[in-house]
Amino acid sequence: PTGAVEVQVPEDPVVALVGTDATLRCSFSPEPGFSLAQLNLIWQLTDTKQLVHSFTEGRDQGSAYANRTALFPDLLAQGNASLRLQRVRVADEGSFTCFVSIRDFGSAAVSLQVAAPYSKPSMTLEPNKDLRPGDTVTITCSSYRGYPEAEVFWQDGQGVPLTGNVTTSQMANEQGLFDVHSVLRVVLGANGTYSCLVRNPVLQQDAHGSVTITGQPMTFPPEA
């Protein structure tokens, strides 16, 4: 061989929403006279080299990864070795290597970043009645089934960040999606609005919730 096969993948991670299909792009430049009988294509998990999908001996050997992968057979001869991953799960996140062997061999790794949007936060107060200025209340902001872990920000009605007395916990469910609960302890003024922002750092998606206290009684803004 005069030089090893050049395998090209995107530099940036592929972002896929949970439950959707993702395409992990990979290409190589076939030489004139190239035939699929010469191609050995292996997709594998980068970390372990565990087989995901392969094309060898002139045919698609199928998925070795929960039967959720497919190649683009009509495009292989043109050097398109991309992999389709169906019904993406949190557990799929990570690096995949595209290994191409013709007369020589080469590989490149592409990262899959999984994401799921967070739900609109629900707000609860404790205590939630007979509130007076000077009372200490606990405001809880809860948002569900997002990925990856959220960033949570609190602010008052004037947009001033509230960073003290905030406790945030995030718990993953069996699918790996996170439920976030953030608790703000605050001493009430005469009136005020307290807002919570739950940000998905990958999707750059913000979910907002707020509660307004105007003397008595309290009001919650209507759901959007």
């Epitope: 061989p1 090893a4 096969v5 050049e6 395998v7 050995n40 292996i42 594998q44 980068t46 970390d47 372990t48 080299k49 565990q50 087989l51 392969s54 060898t56 690096s95 290597t97 290994f99 062997s101 013709i102 007369r103 020589d104 061999f105 080469g106 590989s107 490149a108 790794a109």
Partner: antibody, heavy 124, light 109 residues
């Protein structure tokens, strides 16, 4: 347990060629690449090239391009490395080492098994 | 050409902990470089200790561990034994070729 067993020491004249063999005993070449690595006296390790016998494909380090030929015989689980136009600075110990292409066990051990080495001396 | 940098030599004491590193001229080392660590003792063939960044080869004692630290491949030996005195080479995969570092001579005093 797989072992890589290499051919014996060679003394060669400058300008000649040497062919070193590496036989896998106790296992096959399946799912593996066989790499050739050399070490000149007092120097570090240097990768020369590798072959994937099951895929009939191979790569060479640019430095050795045109001077090294790596082949394999799957039927005997033996890989070969031939170096031509020998010079005195090719005097070295030549090693073969296997590396997983696909980790059937789900664990990538890398270049876990090495041959015992073949000393090649180039001298007039 | 890709250059790889290892500490030329390190000295440690029996029972101590030592970390050897491997830096690449191309930038941060990642899992797709499949960092390997190879041990070589005088008069012996090299022995593969770690593959795939952090996978111990069969027979490698648990005191050897591989990782990525600050963009470099690293080999940590915890509870160093006298028999660990050797030269340690890292090797990184770059798409279609292996590149070896210059080696670190580990001395046990």
């Amino acid at each position: 347990q797989v072992q890589l067993v290499q051919s014996g020491a060679e003394v060669k004249k400058p300008g000649s060629s040497v062919k070193v063999s590496c036989k896998a005993s106790g296992g096959t070449f399946s799912n593996y690449a066989i790499n050739w690595v050399r070490q000149a006296p007092g120097q570090g390790l240097e990768w020369m090239g590798g072959i994937i016998p099951g895929f009939y494909s191979l790569n060479y380090a640019q430095k050795f391009q045109g001077r090294v030929t790596i082949t394999a015989d799957e039927s005997t689980s033996t890989a070969y490395m031939e170096l031509s136009s020998l010079r005195s600075d090719d005097t070295a110990v030549y090693y073969c080492a296997r590396d997983q292409v696909v980790a059937t066990s789900g664990v990538n051990f890398g270049m876990d098994v090495w041959g015992q080495g073949t000393t090649v001396t180039v001298s007039s | 050409d890709i250059q790889m940098t290892q500490e030329p030599s390190l000295t440690t004491s029996p029972g101590g902990t030592v970390t050897l590193t491997c830096r690449s001229s191309t930038g941060a080392v990642t899992t797709s470089n499949y960092a390997n660590w190879v041990q070589e003792k005088p008069g012996q063939a090299p022995r593969g200790l770690i593959g795939g960044t952090n996978k111990r080869a069969p027979g490698t004692p648990a005191r050897f561990s591989g990782s990525l630290i600050g963009g470099k491949a690293a080999l940590t030996i915890t509870g160093v034994q006298p028999e660990d005195e050797a030269i340690y080479f890292c090797a990184l995969w770059y798409s279609n070729l292996w590149v070896f570092g210059g080696g670190t001579k580990l001395e046990i005093k």
